[in-house]
């Protein structure tokens, strides 16, 4: 949070996570000012000379932008007057992780706030029944994770059971040599039960559920960013 008081305005940021290779947003809001031409937004990154992005006098000024951010950043220009200084970041890289500062100056005053940006890879798991196995098994796959996550299985019927002895998890490096595909197989499953495959690293936690009955298979998956 920025410092409130005379000549200072409140600036608020939120810790967030970026998914490598996807587009991300660094969130920052401030006390609105209807005088767009008097608003200056500067995004800085700790350890980087030059700016990540600058918006002033109602338009971008990228003359001081660091090379690593060239062609990758934009503010939501039409939302600046309502106090949105968030930064759109294209093609998130592992090296984009770090501490960013959102600095704001308006006719009301100035303020700044820091933001911790974590980068990694996370994706939804998909669980399928593996009919090829000698005994009925479940196969949980998630295409992109980094850093290497932990994988755990749970079941509604056998709550608290440890499935590590009856499951096998593998990690396959993807073509860009950073992220990995996660595959986990759970053996000896029983019908009329709901199984969950949980994948987690320090950035995200994803869960895939599957309910197998005689007549149907129901699936559900969800993904939650941690510490965001």
């Amino acid at each position: 949070f920025g410092i409130s008081g005379k000549h200072f305005i409140t600036v608020t940021t939120f810790t967030s996570a970026g998914n490598i290779g996807e587009d991300g947003t660094l969130s920052c809001t401030f006390e609105p000012d209807i005088k767009l031409n008097g608003i200056v937004i500067q995004w800085l990154k700790e350890g980087i000379k030059g700016l990540v992005h600058e918006f002033k006098e109602g338009k971008d000024d990228l003359s001081q932008q660091h090379e690593m951010f060239r062609g990758r950043t934009a503010v939501f220009a039409d939302q600046v007057v309502v106090g949105n200084a968030s930064l759109r970041l294209k093609n998130v890289q592992l090296t984009d992780a770090g501490t960013y500062t959102c600095y704001i100056r308006t006719s009301k005053g100035k303020g700044n706030a820091n933001l911790e940006y974590k980068t990694g890879a996370f994706s939804m798991p998909e669980i399928n029944v593996d009919y090829n196995a000698s005994s009925e098994s479940l196969r949980c796959e998630a295409p992109r994770w980094f850093p290497q996550p932990t994988v755990a299985w749970a079941s509604q019927v056998d709550q608290g059971a440890n499935f590590s002895e009856v499951s096998n998890t593998s990690f396959e490096l993807n073509s860009e040599n950073v992220t990995m595909k996660v595959v986990s197989v759970l053996y000896n499953v029983t019908i009329n039960n709901t199984y969950s495959c949980m994948i987690e690293n320090d950035i995200a936690k994803a869960t895939g559920d599957i309910k197998v009955t005689d007549s149907e298979v129901k699936r559900r998956s969800q993904l939650q960013l941690l510490n965001s």
Epitope: K59, L62, G71, N91
Partner: antibody
Framework: QLQLQESGPGLVKPSETLSLTCTVS??????????WGWIRQPPGKGLEWIGN???????YYNPSLKSRVTMSVDTSKNQFSLKLSSVTAADTAVYYC????????????WGQGTLVTVSS | EIVMTQSPATLSVSPGERATLSCRAS??????LAWYQQKPGQAPRLLIY???ARVTGIPARFSGSGSGTEFTLTISSLQSEDFAVYYC?????????FGGGTKVEIK
Amino acid sequence: QLQLQESGPGLVKPSETLSLTCTVSGGSIKSGSHYWGWIRQPPGKGLEWIGNIYYSGSTYYNPSLKSRVTMSVDTSKNQFSLKLSSVTAADTAVYYCAREGSYPNWFDPWGQGTLVTVSS
Amino acid sequence: EIVMTQSPATLSVSPGERATLSCRASQSVSTNLAWYQQKPGQAPRLLIYDASARVTGIPARFSGSGSGTEFTLTISSLQSEDFAVYYCQQYHSFPFTFGGGTKVEIK
């Protein structure tokens, strides 16, 4: 509205340097949210991005052409320029200048293009 | 660099019919993709950016969709002025690259 116009010699000899200038009218080259780019199209073929320049003079070139490309800008004349050295017949193309979004990085509008033939 | 592949190379369509053009990226480009129209002797014209955002002034019959590696440009009902070559362009990472183009011709 914003218009771009390429100018320069239509014929260049092999091993020499191709030089083109793009004049921007109807708007300022100092537009903060835009780069200024060059794209080329060999006869009957597809499009190749050559590189871009910001009004402050910072540049980014296509690695495949980087060793031969130089771009510059003259804000007082509202112009930016392309130089391509050591040309061969493979550099024969229609050369376009265009305004490039800083992000999203679309090209719009484009100049009408100028054909440069490399031949002795 | 990211290689963009367009298919088909040529598409023969009757006026009033729907045209579906495909563009595939060699790796994910998220939604960082633009579509252009080029007529003979003219410069390309921007139609779509961010995979699906139509440029102001471009008719609603043009629509873009897709994300990741698979993209589509759809022209819902072809007009005579729509017969041209269409290019996709990725701006996900440098160097920006274009597809080889799809020529939409009168059937």
